[in-house]
Interface confidence: low
């Protein structure tokens, strides 16, 4: 027989010869990093037809690294489902926790022993420092010094010293996020007050009030013979300006060769029209608003035209 077969997990005991006699036996041992588990044979014999009898290295098993427990509030995931040397261990933390240490450890061979490349990481609870304080406002849980994952705080504005209230600009609720950062910037509290919107040759059909604060919404209708140039609905924005701008009511021109559409009591159907959002503040009117036949709005005797909650 010629030289005996070579294997990944076991090696020949002694030096190989150029050829072997029929009936001659060779023995193998497990390579470094592998260990023998009986009963499979680790030897072979030169057969009379000049071939080696079948043998495999299935009896030699890779050394494995020590078992790693799941970190508290996390998981240790063997990359290939095995702890054998040459493979990796991945660490993941549960939601609301973050990893301190190496995310991946390698099972390495040191001498004939398989050991991990480092110390297993730990999973620490996601914590946020207190959210920012805001001028003219406060948030809930202001006495708490440390916030946990998904803890929420809600901002509100202080009572204003003057006649006009502070309005909350932005989202009132923020959450402690998974990277220990609050979910968004804190809102601001400031006085937002828009000028009384005057539309000549037209009238308000909703949003009656003496003062117009943040998000106050006003809707207009033009008098008979006039049409609306602009949006029928305007909203008081955070800069104390109307958005879109206050519309105009323009006179319907007498018909020429082409007839314009009938625009009596018309309301713009512009696609930019904002959905009417009820004013968040502002005193209720003490006077009777003008009667409107605008479709979808009740007459005054049927109830107030808009909710100014």
């Amino acid at each position: 027989c010629e030289e005996p077969p070579t294997f990944e997990a076991m090696e020949l005991i002694g030096k190989p010869k150029p050829y072997y006699e029929i009936g001659e036996r060779v023995d193998y041992k497990c390579k470094k990093g592998y260990f023998y588990i009986p009963p499979l044979a680790t030897h072979t014999i030169c057969d009379r037809n000049h071939t080696w009898l079948p043998v495999s290295d299935d009896a030699c098993y890779r050394e494995t690294c020590p078992y790693i427990r799941d970190p508290l509030n996390g998981q240790a995931v063997p990359a290939n489902g095995t702890y054998e040397f040459g493979y990796q261990m991945h660490f993941i933390c549960n939601e609301g926790y973050y990893l301190i240490g190496e995310e991946i450890l390698y099972c390495e061979l040191k001498g004939s022993v398989a050991i991990w490349s480092g110390k297993p990481p730990i999973c620490e609870k996601v914590l946020c420092t207190p959210p920012p304080k805001i001028k003219n406002g406060k948030h809930t849980f202001s006495e708490v010094e440390v916030f946990e994952y998904l803890d929420a705080v809600t901002y509100s504005c202080d009572p204003a010293p003057g006649p006009d209230p502070f309005s909350l600009i932005g989202e009132s609720t923020i959450y402690c996020g998974d990277n220990s950062v609050w979910s968004r910037a804190a809102p601001e509290c400031k006085v937002v007050k828009c000028r009384f919107p005057v539309v000549e040759n037209g009238k308000q059909i909703s949003g009656f009030g003496k003062k117009f604060y943040y998000k106050a919404t006003v809707m207009f209708e033009c008098d008979k013979g006039f049409y609306l140039d602009g949006s029928d609905t305007i909203v008081c924005d955070s800069n104390s300006t109307w958005d879109p701008p206050v519309p105009k009511c323009l006179k319907v021109l007498p018909p020429s060769s082409t007839k314009p559409p009938a625009l009596s009591h018309s309301v713009s159907t512009s696609s930019t029209t904002k959905s009417p959002a009820s004013s968040a503040s502002g005193p209720r009117p003490t006077y009777k608003p003008p009667v409107s036949n605008y479709p979808g709005y009740p007459k005054p005797e049927e109830g107030i035209l808009d909710s100014l909650d």
Partner: antibody, heavy 116, light 109 residues
Framework: QVQLVQSGGGVVQPGRSLRLACAAS????????MHWVRQAPGKGLEWVAV????????YYADSVKGRFTISRDNSKNTLYLQMNSLRAEDTAVYYC?????????WGRGTLVTVSS | QSVLTQPPSVSGAPGQRVTISCTGS?????????VHWYQQLPGTAPKLLIY???NRPSGVPDRFSGSKSGTSASLAITGLQAEDEADYYC?????????FGGGTKLTVL
């Protein structure tokens, strides 16, 4: 695997009591606010109650106030809903859910039928 | 009667874009509280689809998007697929109470 496992549903007569449980596996519920949400057959979702992560704050829907009690045992990683003076209109699938302003993990639900 | 109003049903053909509206008031959505969206496939528990008005949890395709303006919000689904057929619920908050819309049944034609 992170999941909420519910138990305790069944058929009960009007005026009687029932306790639902929601056990968390793969996560520690003592870090989270927990809610109960219900869904009557063929209807939409209705929020029932919430308890803060430490159990100190509880809120209830008006429809169950004074009859239902939400509680938690953080050592057992379990949320409870004690339902007393049950009415026919309490018949629903009850879900437990985790989260603060929103519910990012739900149990599979347990059916409560109130019938004589 | 739900405090948040949704259309009872919407439909669209595969590949199309559909939107579902959710209308609240100045005491919930209009007061600055976030809007969240849930998908409920037949016979299963609801699943978070959009949180904080326009954020997607991991695993939710970018075909789903949310927006909020004033007292209302909407969910848009582009490139409609057969597996999107489900009930969709919007949700928000008002003083000590979590709110849900009445739900919208999406049918993929």
């Amino acid at each position: 695997q992170v999941q909420l496992v519910q138990s305790g549903g069944g058929v009960v007569q009007p005026g009687r009591s029932l306790r639902l449980a929601c056990a968390a596996s793969g996560l520690t519920v003592n870090n989270y606010a927990m809610h109960w949400v219900r869904q009557a057959p063929g209807k939409g979702l209705e929020w029932v109650a919430v308890i803060s992560y430490d159990g100190n704050n509880k809120y209830y829907a008006d429809s169950v106030k004074g009859r239902f009690t939400i509680s938690r045992d953080n050592s057992k990683n379990t949320l409870y809903l004690q339902m007393n003076s049950l009415r026919a209109e309490d018949t629903a699938v009850y879900y437990c859910a985790k989260g603060g302003g929103y519910f990012d993990l739900w149990g599979r639900g347990t059916l409560v039928t109130v019938s004589s | 009667q739900s405090v948040l109003t949704q259309p009872p049903s919407v439909s669209g053909a595969p590949g199309q874009r559909v939107t579902i509206s959710c209308t609240g008031s100045s005491s919930n959505i209009g007061a600055g509280y976030d809007v969240h969206w849930y998908q409920q496939l037949p016979g299963t528990a609801p699943k978070l689809l959009i949180y904080g008005n326009n954020n997607r949890p991991s695993g939710v395709p970018d075909r789903f998007s949310g927006s909020k303006s004033g007292t209302s919000a909407s969910l848009a689904i582009t490139g409609l697929q057969a597996e999107d057929e489900a009930d969709y619920y919007c949700s928000s908050y008002t003083s000590g109470t979590w709110l849900f819309g009445g739900g919208t049944k999406l049918t993929v034609l």
